[in-house]
Interface confidence: low
C-alpha cells in the first residue's frame, strides 16, 4: 500500500510518543558521539515536520523517503567532520548509498565512558523534575552504546525503566526497590543487544536465506502444531521486520512488528496454544511476550521423517523441483520434533542433508546413496551433547569465576593475537553459560547453551572485524555461520604465535585495587591472567593456578595493610619475580 507521505503514514501508525522515541534511537545509533541535546533538537525538528505532513500530505518535501529526510537531517550536524572523520563523506552520497554508508560506520565498540549510576535520590529527583527528558536520556545512552539494539524492544525497556522509577521513587527504601530492577534491566538489555546483533550479522554477512533458515528452525520449535505454511508466513514477516531494523529503518520495523503481533494474536488457533496470555497485554509488552513465548507442546502423532525424506523414491524429484521449499520443509519437520536441539545443530543437520542430496541425486542409484543419511547425523548431534556435558561438569566443579578463568586460558591459547579486553569480555560471557544453562533439565541444556554461545561468539566476530588480528578468527567467523562454535571449539594452541615480551608494568598494581567492586577485581585479575598466557602460552594449568593463587593472596594481604600503597610497592615486585620464576 503506497502513501503520498511516508513520514505522515508512520507518524499516524505509531503515534507521537513512539515516533519520537524511534527517531531518537535511530539518530543515536547513527551518530554515537553527538551530545544528547543535539539529538533532541534534531528529533523535535523531524517531529514538527512530520506533523505538517500529517496535516497536508502534499506539503513540500513530505513525499521524500524516510532515508532522505533522516539523512538530510543528520547531515546538518555542524561538527560531523571533526567528530566522525570520514563518516562525513557519507553526506556527499545520494540515497540509498548514503544510508548504506552510515550503516557501515556504526561502531560496535564506541569509545564512550562506561555509564555510572548516580545515587538513587539524585536519579529520583531527575525523574520527577523532568520525566520525559529522563527517559529520552535512557534511550539515547543505550542506543549510542548499542547501535544495533532492536529499536521497538528498546521502547519496551524504556517503559519498564519508567515503571521502575515511578514505583520505587515513592517507596520507603528507594534503593532496595530500585537497584535490583535496574540491575535486571541492565543485564537483560545487554543480552537483548547481543541477540539482536547476531540477527543483524546473520542478515548482513550471510544474507536473508541464512536468517530465514534460522527463523524456520526456531519458530518450528516454538510452534510445532502450526502448519508449514503458517510458519513460512511468520518467517517471511519476521525477516522483513529484522531486515528493516538492522538496516536502520526503525519506523517501518516497529510498525511491521506491531502488525506481526496483531496477526499472531488474531490467528492463535493455527499458531500456538501458548500465545493467549501475551495477546491480552499492551503493544510493547505483547510483542516482547510473543518473542519470548515458550515452546508449545509437540503434536502426539507426528510420523517418522524417514518416510518422506529417506525412504521415498521421490526425494530427488521433490528436491530438484524446489530446493529451498523442500529443505525448508525438512528443517520445519525436524525442528518441530526436536525442541531439545539447538537451532545451530538443526541448521547443521539441514546443511548435511542438503549436501547428501546434492551428491546423491547425481549418482547412479540416488536412493541407495542417501539411504543412510540419518546415520550421518549422529556425530553432528553427539558433538554439542558432549560439549555441553563436559562444560557443565567443569562449571559445577569450579564455580563461575574459575570456570571463566578456564575459558580465558583456553581461548587465549587458541587466539592469543586478540586484544586482552576483548578476550576478557568474551570469555567472561562464555563463562556465564554455566549459570544460565547447566541448571536446566537435560532437554533444555543444549538449545540454551549452544545458541547462547553463538550470540557470544558473534560479539567476538564483530569486534574482531573492526580490527582484524587473527586469520583463525576471521576464518571461523566468515566461513559458516552455523559452524562458528564448532570451528572455535576445534582450535588448538596457536603454535605459530610468538609469545609477548614480559612487561612488568602490566603486573604492577596499586592501592586503588582495594576499593574496586568484586566484579571489577575479577576483571583486573582476569586481565592479568590473559597477559600471563600471552607471555607463556605453554604454561600448564597448575603453573597458572599457582600464580593466580599467589596474586589473590598478595592483593588480599596489601588490602588489609595499614599503608596499602607501600605494601603494593614492596610486595608487587616480589610477586612479579616469583611469577616469572614459577613460569620459567
Amino acid at each position: 500500500d503506497t502513501h503520498k507521505s511516508e513520514v505522515a503514514h508512520r507518524f499516524k501508525d505509531l503515534g507521537e510518543e513512539h515516533f519520537k522515541g524511534l527517531v531518537l534511537v535511530a539518530f543515536s545509533q547513527y551518530l554515537q558521539q553527538c551530545p544528547f541535546e543535539e539529538h533532541v533538537k534534531l528529533v523535535n525538528e523531524v517531529t514538527e515536520f512530520a506533523k505538517t505532513c500529517v496535516a497536508d500530505e502534499s506539503a513540500e518535501n513530505c513525499d521524500k523517503s524516510l532515508h532522505t529526510l533522516f539523512g538530510d537531517k543528520l547531515c546538518t550536524v555542524a561538527t560531523l567532520r571533526e567528530t566522525y572523520g570520514e563518516m562525513a563523506d557519507c553526506c556527499a552520497k545520494q540515497e540509498p548509498e548514503r544510508n548504506e554508508c552510515f550503516l557501515q560506520h556504526k561502531d560496535d565498540n564506541p569509545n564512550l565512558p562506561p555509564l555510572v549510576r548516580p545515587e538513587v535520590d539524585v536519579m529520583c529527583t531527575a525523574f520527577h523534575d523532568n520525566e520525559a527528558t529522563f527517559l529520552k536520556k535512557y534511550l539515547y545512552e543505550v542506543a549510542r552504546r548499542h547501535p544495533y539494539f532492536y529499536a521497538p524492544e528498546l521502547l519496551f525497556f524504556a517503559a519498564r525503566y519508567k515503571a521502575a522509577f515511578a514505583e520505587c521513587c515513592q517507596a520507603a527504601d528507594k534503593a532496595a526497590c530500585l537497584l535490583p530492577k535496574l540491575d535486571e534491566l541492565r543485564d537483560e538489555g545487554k543480552a537483548s543487544s547481543a541477540k539482536q546483533r547476531l540477527k543483524c550479522a546473520s542478515l548482513q554477512k550471510f544474507g536473508d536465506r541464512a536468517f530465514k533458515a534460522w527463523a524456520v528452525a526456531r519458530l518450528s520449535q516454538k510452534f510445532p502444531k502450526a502448519e508449514f505454511a503458517e510458519v513460512s508466513k511468520l518467517v517471511t514477516d519476521l525477516t522483513k521486520v529484522h531486515t528493516e531494523c538492522c538496516h536502520g529503518d526503525l519506523l517501518e520495523c516497529a510498525d511491521d512488528r506491531a502488525d506481526l503481533a496483531k496477526y499472531m494474536c488474531e490467528n492463535q488457533d493455527s499458531i500456538s496454544s501458548k500465545l493467549k496470555e501475551c495477546c491480552d497485554k499492551p503493544l510493547l509488552e505483547k510483542s516482547h511476550c510473543l518473542a519470548e513465548v515458550e515452546n508449545d507442546e509437540m503434536p502426539a502423532d507426528l510420523p517418522s521423517l524417514a518416510a518422506d525424506y529417506v525412504e521415498s523414491k521421490d526425494v530427488c524429484k521433490n528436491y530438484a523441483e524446489a530446493k529451498d521449499v523442500f529443505l525448508g520443509m525438512f528443517l520445519y519437520e525436524y525442528a518441530r520434533r526436536h525442541p531439545d536441539y539447538s537451532v545451530m545443530l538443526l541448521l547443521r543437520l539441514a546443511k548435511a542433508y542438503e549436501a547428501t542430496l546434492e551428491k546423491c541425486c547425481a549418482a547412479a542409484d540416488p536412493h541407495e546413496c542417501y539411504a543412510k543419511v540419518f546415520d550421518e547425523f549422529q556425530p553432528l548431534v553427539e558433538e554439542p551433547q558432549n560439549l555441553v556435558k563436559q562444560n557443565c561438569e567443569l562449571f559445577e566443579q569450579l564455580g563461575e569465576y574459575k570456570f571463566q578463568n578456564a575459558l580465558l586460558v583456553r581461548y587465549t591459547k587458541k587466539v592469543p593475537q586478540v586484544s586482552t579486553p576483548t578476550l576478557v569480555e568474551v570469555s567472561r560471557n562464555l563463562g556465564k553459560v554455566g549459570a544460565k544453562c547447566c541448571k536446566l533439565p537435560e532437554a533444555k541444556r543444549m538449545p540454551c547453551a549452544e545458541d547462547y554461545l553463538s550470540v557470544v561468539l558473534n560479539r567476538l566476530c564483530v569486534l574482531h572485524e573492526k580490527t582484524p588480528v587473527s586469520e583463525k578468527v576471521t576464518k571461523c567467523c566468515t566461513e559458516s555461520l552455523v559452524n562458528r562454535r564448532p570451528c572455535f571449539s576445534a582450535l588448538e594452541l596457536d603454535e605459530a604465535y610468538v609469545p609477548k615480551a614480559f612487561n612488568a608494568e602490566t603486573f604492577t598494581f596499586h592501592a586503588d585495587m582495594c576499593t574496586l567492586s568484586e566484579k571489577e577485581k575479577q576483571v583486573k585479575k582476569q586481565t592479568a591472567l590473559v597477559e600471563l598466557v600471552k607471555h607463556k602460552p605453554k604454561a600448564t594449568k597448575e603453573q597458572l593456578k599457582g600464580v593466580m593463587d599467589n596474586f589473590a593472596a598478595f592483593v588480599e594481604k596489601c588490602c588489609k595493610a595499614d599503608d596499602k600503597e607501600a605494601c603494593f610497592a614492596e610486595e608487587g615486585p616480589k610477586f612479579v619475580a616469583a611469577s616469572q620464576a614459577a613460569l620459567a
Partner: nanobody, 115 residues
Framework: QVQLVESGGGLVQAGGSLRLSCAAS????????MSWVRQAPGKGPEWVSA????????RYAESVKGRFTISRDNAKKTLYLQMNSLKPEDTAVYYC????????GSQGTQVTVSS
C-alpha cells in the same frame, strides 16, 4: 487458519478440457510458490506442476508438459490449472499445496477422464 479449497473437477471425455481453481485463505498467498499434486486410486501422490510466488516461473511434470498450464491471480488469492487434451491416465484427485509439498492439506477435487 490456512485453507485451500479446490474446485472445477468433474467427468470429461478423453481429449476434453477442464479448469481447476484453488482458493487460498489464512496466509499471505502472494509470498508462496504453489503446486498442483494428484493422487490416482491406489497410488501415491504425484507432483504435477508448480508456479513461483510472482507467477513468473512455472514447471511441469513430464507427463503433463504441453497439455497443462498453471497460473495464479494473487489479487484473488487463487491458483489455476488449465488441463487440455485430457487422457484416462489423468484420472485422479487433484489438490493444491503450498510450496512443493506432496503432503495433502486439503480435500481435493476429483477429475475423471473416460475413454
Amino acid at each position: 487458519q490456512v485453507q485451500l479449497v479446490e474446485s472445477g473437477g468433474g467427468l470429461v471425455q478423453a481429449g476434453g478440457s477442464l479448469r481447476l481453481s484453488c482458493a487460498a485463505s489464512g496466509f499471505t498467498f502472494g509470498s508462496f510458490g504453489m503446486s498442483w499434486v494428484r493422487q490416482a486410486p491406489g497410488k501415491g501422490p504425484e507432483w504435477v506442476s508448480a508456479i513461483d510466488s510472482g507467477g513468473v516461473d512455472t514447471r511441469y511434470a513430464e507427463s503433463v508438459k504441453g497439455r497443462f498450464t498453471i497460473s495464479r491471480d494473487n489479487a484473488k488469492k487463487t491458483l489455476y490449472l488449465q488441463m487440455n487434451s485430457l487422457k484416462p491416465e489423468d484420472t485422479a484427485v487433484y489438490y493444491c499445496t503450498i510450496g512443493q509439498s506432496t503432503s495433502r492439506g486439503s480435500q481435493g477435487t476429483q477429475v475423471t477422464v473416460s475413454s
